[in-house]
Interface confidence: low
């Protein structure tokens, strides 16, 4: 029959033959030599009192005689050993000369062929009656993953033969498959921790440890769930797993008590316009609970203001908010506060920010347009709009003039300095309508355009115009 043994120190340069796949470190390479006295097991017994899967008797095409059944010899059924030990076991088979076609022996584990990192060696012992084949299998420094059912397969005369399984059981210290997880909990609120470890050997018993002291006097069978009624301060929990091989301790996990967040820091102004301020901040410590939202508090910094605070709410991320609908050329104090499920943080330090000057809020008034036929120009006049301080300093005007005639459309604009309240524009097209609009410009931007004033440019000397800042859809007053 077959044998199994555990070995501590074995050179892996044993003999290898046949097309059996496997892999070894290159400095331990067996060489093919079917006959050698080195490191051979004694030839197996030919008797088959415990045959495994058997190749049925077959009739050969030449001699027409019945071939005897072939099976793997009975081998050891169960190997128990400790982790990191070496193990060696084998399958053996006796094949009479009457069998013509045989393939190499392949090793299988739990139904899958072992093509990988395992050491397998096949040895042949021929005699007058046939050949005895021993397939040796060895695993150096066994691990838990080597646990399982191993067996040999071989094809004889196109029939597959399977050996009895050899069950390898690797025993070691308990192995954690579930360790307690770090959690953040509300003060004085119950929570659960789970610990699960396995052998072999079983059973595995669990002790819980809180801040270096055992929680349970009697061990619990794995898996174990510890219900903690509540904590008032941070604690460290771990679990001990015990079996016959010894003890393994899980990682220690911190259980934190949720508190309100720390105030945000580094509040900065990224950009200012006349009516908005873009503010950023760095969130403070979240208090072991995710930040849910933030509040931006804005108050006018001028002494004359009534001190009322505007509040703008936003999501906790991104740490950025554009405060809108602010007055132009105004000073504001800004602070940020954020909240988690426990509550609001204190506000950040207040910072000062200013909006820039705005664009004018009203258009120029009293617009008149007159055609100077002798010079072929339009004479445009207006009065300065009432510009507030926050609208900024007047820098000039933009005059938009649109010319329309049959088949022609021309849109033009001019900018003039703030000094005057009149401008002259050359006539672009005769026999056309010209629509004039004017807007005031400050450093803050361009204000609204005035209502359009229309004037008809005749072919010759006739002209109609509208001396008004109100809409003039057609010919109004005649000149």
């Amino acid at each position: 029959g077959g044998t199994a043994e555990k070995w501590e120190e074995t050179e892996l340069d044993q003999l290898f033959s046949g097309p059996l796949p496997g892999r070894l470190p290159v400095n331990h390479r067996p060489f093919s030599a079917p006959h050698s006295s080195r490191d051979q097991l004694p030839p197996p017994q030919t008797g088959r009192s415990h045959p495994a899967h058997t190749a049925a008797p077959q009739v050969t095409s030449t001699a027409s005689k019945l071939l005897p059944p072939v099976a793997f010899n009975h081998t050891i059924g169960h190997i128990v050993l400790s982790e990191h030990k070496n193990v060696k076991f084998n399958c053996s088979i006796n094949i009479p000369n009457t069998y013509q076609e045989t393939a190499g022996i392949s090793w299988w584990k739990d139904g899958k062929e072992l093509l990988g990192a395992h050491h397998s060696i096949t040895q042949f012992y021929p005699d007058e009656e046939g050949v005895s084949i021993i397939a040796l299998f060895s695993i150096a420094s066994v691990q838990r993953s080597d646990n399982g059912s191993y067996f040999c397969k071989m094809k004889v005369n196109n029939r597959e033969i399977v050996s009895d399984p050899i069950y390898v059981e690797v025993q070691g210290l308990p192995y954690f498959i579930k360790q307690p997880e770090s959690v953040n909990v509300t003060r004085n609120t119950a929570f659960n921790l789970t610990c699960q470890a396995v052998g072999p050997p079983e059973p595995v018993n669990i002790f819980w440890v809180q801040n270096s002291s055992r929680v349970n006097e009697k061990p619990e069978r794995s898996p174990s769930v510890l219900t903690v009624p509540g904590l008032t301060e941070t604690a460290v929990f771990s679990c001990e797993a015990h079996n016959d091989k010894g003890l393994t301790v899980s990682k220690g996990v911190h259980i934190n008590i949720k508190v309100i967040p720390s105030p945000p820091t580094e509040v900065h102004i990224l950009n200012s316009t006349a009516h908005s301020i873009l503010v950023s901040w760095v969130p403070g410590f979240d208090g072991y609970s995710p930040l849910q939202n933030c509040s931006i508090q804005v108050k006018e910094a001028d002494r004359l203001s009534n001190g009322s605070v505007m509040v703008f709410n936003t999501s906790a991320s991104p740490h950025l908010y554009e405060i809108q609908q602010l007055q132009a050329l105004a000073n504001y104090s800004i602070a940020v506060s954020c909240r988690n499920e426990i509550g609001w943080s204190a506000v950040s330090p207040w910072i000062l920010a200013s909006t820039t000057e705005g664009a004018p809020s009203v258009a120029p008034l009293n617009i008149t347009v007159f055609l100077n036929e002798s010079n072929n120009i339009l004479d445009i006049r207006w009065t300065k709009p009432p510009i507030k301080r926050q609208d900024g300093e007047l820098v000039g005007y933009r005059i938009s003039h649109v010319w329309e005639s049959a088949g022609t459309y021309k849109e033009l604009s001019e900018e003039v300095s703030q000094n005057g309240s009149w401008a002259q524009i050359p006539v672009q097209i005769h026999n056309a309508t010209c629509t004039v609009r004017i807007a005031a410009i400050t450093k803050g931007g361009i204000g609204p355009f005035s209502e359009p004033v229309n004037i008809i440019i005749p072919e010759h000397s006739k002209v109609d115009y509208a001396p008004s800042s109100t809409p003039a859809p057609g010919n109004t007053d005649s000149m």
């Epitope: 059996l20 067996p30 062929e113």
Partner: antibody, heavy 121, light 107 residues
Amino acid sequence: QVQLQQPGAELVKPGASVKLSCKASGYTFTSYWMHWVKQRPGQGLEWIGMIHPNINTNYNEKFKSKATLTVDISSSTAYMQLSSLTSEDSAVYYCAKRSPYSNYDWYFDVWGTGTTVTVSS
Amino acid sequence: DIQMTQSPASLSVSVGETVTITCRASENIYSNLAWYQQKQGKSPQLLVYAATNLADGVPSRFSGSGSGTQYSLKINSLQSEDFGSYYCQHFWGTPLTFGAGTKLELK
């Protein structure tokens, strides 16, 4: 001397299948694993799988549903069938013989000339 | 699966220079490593097997070294016929994997 002969090119339509051949000569065909390797244009090498005439096949998981490896011992020829072809399968496919030094040293001392598979409608 | 990380991806060198290509395995492959050379439009050619052994007919200016997870291929006094792509490959079980390759170009 040891040789692995492969046809030069195959043009196939998307969704179709193609069966590539690799004829071995100069060594005992039944004693060695035959491997198949893919190389897309301008790319590196990808191992598809291997077949031993007397033992069985072993596939790269990535190609399990794409490639089927077979052998014809009588003609010392290895085959690889590629199914449900797409443009991703356009590549040069090599067969390669493992080294003679040992049965588990799966590196390749002899390569086929490669078959260029073009998948195009 | 074992990943093979090869560097550099490309190298521009002159004839007569010495170059070193490295290959890192994602786990110990116990010297089960081969190096190949491939020229444009040709099949790969075995250069080195078992990390350090030169294949038949490969010039002695090629040498392989390394163990564990780190391996390298050195080419002394580069010749014009040495330009092309180089690949490492592990054979420590299946699936076999190759490095992404190093392209050696003439400067």
